[in-house]
């Protein structure tokens, strides 16, 4: 009888010999619960677990706390992998986070954090980041120190406003802060002077809504 192999992340998938981009079934740490994720096996050596993707506006990202917890969308297109899985995974070992961005003029940039993890749900999936490098700005567009995650029905930001309702989407809002990759998707020629678009301030500045974004993680010792 063939032994059932389970993978915690795309790095393990890659190391097992599966080196083709695509959707793979991953297993929660210390559990039999499964989740489908897209694995990028080509970029920067491969083994990347995609935890977020925006590319065409086909998926609504103004979702509830529960939806951001368990994930939504389609791993082959626009999706959010799920805060609970990412939290559990990134607390098992050290992970890096790479954020890849595209603007509407054909430019690409990235931000790489050498250490990334999310706190538990009890701590509102607070983001923790260290060691920024990359081409998408010398200053982190995710506010430091990291903030709690907020959604339209879970207001944990540092503003006595409701950032998730004002700027749309779930994110680690400050008050409200220089980034939101889960904002409203605006098509070309409608993507400037937007309050609530897909923003990475320290790359594109005020009011610019990006064309595409990918957030991906990989063990630091890969």
């Amino acid at each position: 009888k063939e032994e059932q192999i389970s993978f915690r992340d795309c790095a393990e998938v890659f190391k097992s010999g599966h080196t083709t981009n695509g959707i793979y079934t991953l297993t929660f740490p210390n559990s039999t619960e499964e989740i489908k994720a897209y694995c990028d096996m080509e970029a920067g050596g491969g083994g990347w677990t995609i935890i977020q993707r925006r590319e065409d506006g086909s998926v609504d990202f103004q979702r509830t706390w529960k939806e951001y917890k368990v994930g939504f969308g389609n791993p082959s297109g626009e999706y959010w992998l799920g805060n609970e899985f990412v939290s559990q995974l990134t607390n098992q070992q050290r992970y890096v986070l790479k954020i890849h961005l595209k603007d509407w003029e054909g430019n690409e940039a990235y931000s790489l954090y050498e250490h990334f993890y999310l706190s538990s749900e009890e701590l509102n999936y607070r983001i923790h980041l260290k060691g920024l490098t990359g081409t998408a700005g010398k200053i982190s567009s995710i506010s430091q120190p990291g903030n709690d995650f907020s959604t339209k029905d879970g207001d944990n930001d540092k503003c006595i406003c409701k950032c998730s309702q004002m700027l749309t989407g779930g994110w680690w809002f400050d008050a409200c802060g220089p980034s939101n990759l889960n904002g409203m998707y605006y098509p070309q020629r409608q993507n400037t002077n937007k309050f609530n678009g897909i923003k990475w301030y320290y790359w594109k500045g005020s009011g610019y809504s990006l064309k595409a974004t990918t957030m991906m993680i990989r063990p630091a010792d890969f």
């Epitope: 950032c163 400050d174 409200c176 005020s206």
Partner: antibody, heavy 129, light 109 residues
Framework: QVQLVQSGAEVKKPGASVKVSCKAS????????MHWVRQAPGQGLEWMGW????????NYAQKFQGRVTMTRDTSISTAYMELSRLRSDDTAVYYC??????????????????????WGQGTMVTVSS | SYVLTQPPSVSVAPGQTARITCGGN??????VHWYQQKPGQAPVLVVY???DRPSGIPERFSGSNSGNTATLTISRVEAGDEADYYC???????????FGGGTKLTVLS
């Protein structure tokens, strides 16, 4: 922690000017408006105006136009309120208070009227001959 | 300019419910904020955007706003709630903040 610390009490003569400072700490100074509110003895709160520390833009209450000047020094995260041509009825406690600018990174010129979530301890200004 | 009217004083026994009103023309169309000020201290925000509470403010404090009246409600009143309470709105026509005249809440002993 987040706090606003104001300068000490002042005693001034009528016709003089007073400049009160408000030092911010524990947050992104540029991302919050700074307001000035005064309270005469036994009276209510009176809004004087705000400054946007990011741009330096100001909005003064009509009553104080021409007499009040609000400035800031972002390098030391400090806001200032100067009131000139003082009269005896300017005797009051002067407070600074911040309110968030949630659109700071989208459009620095757009004012969002959020409540004042943190206040300074107040500065007593006495105008007397 | 926009005017907010508050009763000068409200008295309530401990454990009872206090209601402080703030009147203004069509105030229901505006966001109302409420501040508590104890003697010799700076004001503290207790309710914002009509009915939301900042972190650290007890659930006993709540707010509502419709028509021409906004109301701050303090349930199960305690002696420590004795203070002046001010309502506040942004008057978009003048681009000015406006405070009500304040209400002194007395907790009867």
């Amino acid at each position: 922690q987040v706090q606003l610390v104001q300068s000490g009490a002042e005693v001034k003569k009528p016709g003089a000017s007073v400049k009160v400072s408000c030092k911010a700490s524990g947050y992104n100074f540029a991302g919050y408006y700074m307001h000035w509110v005064r309270q005469a003895p036994g009276q209510g709160l009176e809004w004087m105006g705000w400054i946007n520390p990011n741009s330096g833009g100001t909005n003064y209450a009509q009553k104080f136009q021409g007499r009040v000047t609000m400035t800031r020094d972002t390098s030391i995260s400090t806001a200032y309120m100067e009131l000139s041509r003082l009269r005896s009825d300017d005797t009051a406690v002067y407070y600074c208070a911040r309110s968030p600018n949630p659109y700071y990174y989208e459009s620095p010129g757009y004012y969002y009227p959020a409540a004042f979530d943190i206040w300074g301890q107040g500065t007593m200004v006495t105008v007397s001959s | 300019s926009y005017v907010l009217t508050q009763p000068p004083s409200v008295s309530v026994a401990p454990g009872q419910t206090a209601r402080i009103t703030c009147g203004g023309n069509n105030i229901g169309s505006k966001s109302v904020h409420w501040y508590q000020q104890k003697p010799g201290q700076a004001p503290v925000l207790v309710v914002y955007d009509d009915s939301d509470r900042p972190s650290g403010i007890p659930e006993r404090f709540s707010g509502s706003n419709s028509g021409n009246t906004a109301t701050l409600t303090i349930s199960r009143v305690e002696a420590g709630d004795e203070a002046d309470y001010y309502c506040q709105v942004w008057d978009s026509s003048s681009d000015h903040w406006v405070f009500g005249g304040g209400t002194k809440l007395t907790v009867l002993s």
